[in-house]
């Protein structure tokens, strides 16, 4: 999906009002310095591409974050504010359902959500130069 036509300010507002709190809740009990940010993004569409990938694509050691509250809200926000997003994602979501694993919070998942927090922070500050 090409995130270029999304309403970035509305997505930012949805992040600040709800998604950010859910990410903090998921990470509760973890020190903010525990993980290094290794995933970066250069502009808002790129940030959303990376956020979608880390949130919804299974990775080694972290089978699925898709049923977490922050993920469901991320999906809804993208569907509302990114024209045509729902249509492009339905087939992908159905394929994912067949592979879904039981919800387990592993250290790898915590690291992945820490990366997500960094991507969202970057999304919210699009005018900052890339380090």
């Amino acid at each position: 999906y090409d995130f270029t036509n999304c309403d970035f300010e509305k997505i930012k507002a949805a992040y600040l009002s709800t998604i950010s709190k859910d990410l903090i809740t998921y990470m509760s009990g973890t020190k903010s310095t525990e993980f290094n940010n290794t995933v970066s993004c250069s502009n808002r569409p790129h940030c959303l591409t990376e956020i979608q990938s880390l949130t919804f694509n299974p990775t080694a050691g972290c089978a699925s974050l898709a049923k977490e509250m922050f993920a469901m809200k991320t999906k809804a926000a993208l569907a509302i504010w990114c024209p045509g997003y729902s249509e492009t994602q339905i087939n992908a979501t159905q394929a994912m359902k067949k592979r879904r694993k039981r919800k387990v919070t592993t250290n790898k998942c915590l690291e992945q959500v820490s990366q997500l927090q960094g991507l969202w922070r970057r999304f919210n500050r699009p005018l900052l130069k890339q380090q």
């Epitope: 309403d7 507002a13 949805a14 009002s17 469901m72 809200k73 809804a76 024209p83």
Partner: antibody, heavy 121, light 113 residues
Framework: QVQLVQSGAEVKKPGASVKVSCKAS????????MYWVRQAPGQGPEWMGW????????NYVQKFQGRVTMTRDTSISTAYMELSRMRSDDTAVYYC??????????????WGLGTLVTVSS | QSVLTQPPSVSGAPGQRVTISCTGS?????????VHWYQQLPGTAPKLLIY???NRPSGVPDRFSGSKSGTSASLAITGLQAEDEADYYC?????????????FGGGTKLTVL
């Protein structure tokens, strides 16, 4: 105060199109998203999609994709919703509703009075 | 069939307290999405009554209050008055992409006896 004045009732034949207008006053038209919601007789409201009056950008609920078109004319602070290839189950009151929140989630803070569209052969 | 389930009708005598439930699932209310309530007086457009679970827009009497727990939300009306007779609708959001993301309940008709 915020006012959304909609066009009058319409009777259409199956297969026809309808275009409903919504004239806004009492606020800066381009500052707030406009949503369209319909309500069939005896049922709950149903969201149809949004238009950003500033950019003209739109997003439609999948169910209406390909049949609905939302437009606006900023010079007269008016939003339009056109529904094509209508069927009898499109008979409903169609409302425009102005966004009210800064939370990033649609909130229907102000509603037009509604336009009854009847589809009948 | 609405995504959010409400009782078709409730009733109460003037001065009484009534509650209207709104039951969802793990993909909407249970996922932590906010719930809003609308009042629709006979023959009129809906009006925002409660937003973000328990907040009242200015002009809405404090007799109206909202709450949310788990996969359900409730609207409570105390000191029932004749002018409260109306249809009430809950609204939230859903992460199921095959339907509408903005979802409503089917409505509850409140009768003041």
């Amino acid at each position: 105060q915020v006012q959304l004045v909609q066009s009058g009732a319409e009777v259409k034949k199956p297969g026809a199109s309808v275009k409903v207008s919504c004239k806004a006053s009492g606020y800066t038209f381009t500052d707030y998203y406009m949503y369209w919601v319909r309500q069939a007789p005896g049922q709950g409201p149903e969201w149809m999609g949004w238009i950003n009056p500033n950019s003209g950008g739109t997003n439609y609920v999948q169910k209406f994709q390909g049949r609905v078109t939302m437009t606006r004319d900023t010079s007269i602070s008016t939003a339009y919703m056109e529904l094509s290839r209508m069927r009898s189950d499109d008979t409903a009151v169609y409302y425009c509703a102005r966004d009210g929140g800064s939370s990033g989630w649609p909130l229907f803070a102000y509603w037009g009075l509604g336009t009854l569209v009847t589809v009948s052969s | 069939q609405s995504v959010l389930t409400q009782p078709p009708s409730v009733s109460g005598a003037p001065g009484q307290r009534v509650t209207i439930s709104c039951t969802g699932s793990s993909s909407n209310i249970g996922a932590g999405f906010d719930v809003h309530w609308y009042q629709q007086l006979p023959g009129t457009a809906p009006k925002l009554l409660i937003y973000d679970n328990n907040n009242r827009p200015s002009g809405v009497p404090d007799r109206f209050s909202g709450s949310k727990s788990g996969t359900s939300a409730s609207l409570a009306i105390t000191g029932l008055q004749a002018e409260d007779e109306a249809d009430y609708y809950c609204q939230s959001y859903d992460s199921n992409l095959s339907g509408s993301i903005v979802v409503f309940g089917g409505g509850t008709k409140l009768t003041v006896l």
